[in-house]
Interface confidence: medium
């Protein structure tokens, strides 16, 4: 079930998905001056079975100049960007798929793709928010939004994140402070260990941790 609307927009914040639920579609958009190849896919689709998920279809772009037409498929201008976009992640970094069954990783870039990716999310998708550079988080979280189905309609939960300029006051007059709701707290899944000087390898919460320390002298 596709989500009807877009994840909430938070001023001075961007969102990203860590992985994409099966059923998610990614538009095959090309950068200015390029277009989808003739009979090329309109979108990539995250599909899979219980053990493996992957993107079906391949996006391919070709130079618009190779065809005698003025029509181009290009991303919208910066000031009229479609929503449901995430910036390309570069370099592509793999997501721990084993812990996310039924999800696809970020698809690798294709040649001459648009600078913004347009996704069509499905119910259950979670996206994460962070303040853009130069802004700091007020109400430090939970800065995620989930597409949920309620009474036959889809809606995105509201992330509790406000991004404010460093020089701005930390109070917003007349603004109600959202109360955090701790019920959605996930159980601990990850152990994090820093190094020790004697290079111990410890086990904590059933997870083994590798540790290391590096020192460098300034030349």
């Amino acid at each position: 079930e596709l989500c009807d609307d877009d994840p909430p927009e938070i001023p001075h914040a961007t969102f990203k998905a860590m992985a994409y639920k099966e059923g998610t579609m990614l538009n095959c958009e090309c950068k200015r001056g390029f277009r989808r190849i003739k009979s090329g896919s309109l979108y990539m689709l995250c599909t899979g079975n219980s053990s493996h998920s992957s993107w079906d279809n391949q996006c391919q772009c070709t130079s618009s100049a190779t065809r005698n037409t003025t029509k181009q498929v290009t991303p919208q201008p910066e000031e009229q960007k479609e929503r449901k976009t995430t910036e390309m992640q570069s370099p592509m970094q793999p997501v721990d798929q084993a812990s996310l069954p039924g999800h696809c990783r970020e698809p690798p870039p294709w040649e001459n793709e648009a600078t913004e990716r347009i996704y069509h999310f499905v119910v259950g998708q979670m996206v994460y928010y962070q303040c853009v550079q130069g802004y700091r988080a007020l109400h430090r979280g939970p800065a995620e939004s989930v597409c949920k189905m309620t009474h036959g309609k889809t809606r995105w939960t509201q992330p509790q994140l406000i991004c404010t300029g460093e020089m701005e006051t930390s109070q917003f007059p007349g603004e109600e402070k959202p109360q955090a709701s701790p019920e959605g707290r996930p159980e601990s899944e990850t152990s994090c260990l820093v190094t020790t000087t004697d290079f111990q390898i410890q086990t904590e919460m059933a997870a083994t941790m590798e540790t290391s320390i590096f020192t460098t002298e300034y030349q």
């Epitope: 997501v95 721990d96 994460y128 109400h139 430090r140 979280g141 939970p142 800065a143 601990s188 990850t190």
Partner: antibody
Framework: PGSSVKVSCKAS????????ISWVRQAPGQGLEWMGG????????NYAQKFQGRVTITADESTSTAYMELSSLRSEDTAVYYC????????????WGQGTTVTVSS | DIQMTQSPSSLSASVGDRVTITCRAS??????LNWYQQKPGKAPKLLIY???SLQSGVPSRFSGSGSGTDFTLTISSLQPEDFATYYC?????????FGQGTKLETK
């Protein structure tokens, strides 16, 4: 003094990318001090004003490892350095590393 | 930055006592307040998050309350393993800041 140290924090047993990894230090006999943090999925770090320009926090999603590098070390940087995980900067730092003792001496 | 002030800075108590530690924020932080316990040579351990929610695996003798600027950590019946240093921490805004700590010692 004057050198730099890079400490790594490797997580295993679950999803790494969407959690915030914070670095907190504790000087001998002193309290806890937040240095900065990173959410690996975004890659950009936040730093406490006090450490701005001297600390660099990075993360490598492919190895589920976060790094904290502190440069221009001085004697007052002698401390135990912890990494801690928090679910998106709200629920508190629920999983901590065991700590690395960094001693700065000439 | 938001300042967090804990009181008392040290406290002597006996096993079985009811102990209360308070934490005050320099501005309203809603319920964005966490409590940690730290024993010598060990990493801090999260006890309470969101002012009053008990972290998984933490004994129910620990409880937290408060909202806005004033918060309390209560240990209903002190156990031998509870002697440690306790810290409050606000997660309302960046940077997160900690109280100076309350050292709980045996009487």
């Amino acid at each position: 003094p004057g050198s730099s140290v890079k400490v790594s924090c490797k997580a295993s047993g679950g999803t790494f990318s969407s959690y915030a990894i914070s670095w907190v230090r504790q000087a001998p006999g002193q309290g806890l001090e937040w240095m900065g943090g990173i959410i690996p999925i975004f890659g950009t770090a936040n730093y406490a004003q006090k450490f701005q320009g001297r600390v660099t926090i990075t993360a490598d999603e492919s190895t589920s490892t976060a790094y904290m590098e502190l440069s221009s070390l001085r004697s007052e940087d002698t401390a135990v350095y912890y990494c801690a995980r928090e679910m998106y900067y709200y629920y508190g730092m629920d999983v901590w590393g065991q700590g690395t003792t960094v001693t700065v001496s000439s | 930055d938001i300042q967090m002030t804990q009181s008392p800075s040290s406290l002597s108590a006996s096993v079985g006592d009811r102990v209360t530690i308070t934490c005050r924020a320099s501005q309203s932080i809603s319920n964005y307040l966490n409590w940690y316990q730290q024993k010598p040579g060990k990493a801090p351990k999260l006890l309470i998050y969101a002012a009053s929610s008990l972290q998984s695996g933490v004994p129910s003798r620990f409880s937290g309350s408060g909202s806005g600027t004033d918060f309390t950590l209560t240990i209903s019946s002190l156990q031998p393993e509870d002697f440690a240093t306790y810290y409050c921490q606000q997660s309302y805004s960046t940077p997160p800041t900690f109280g100076q700590g309350t050292k709980l010692e045996t009487k």
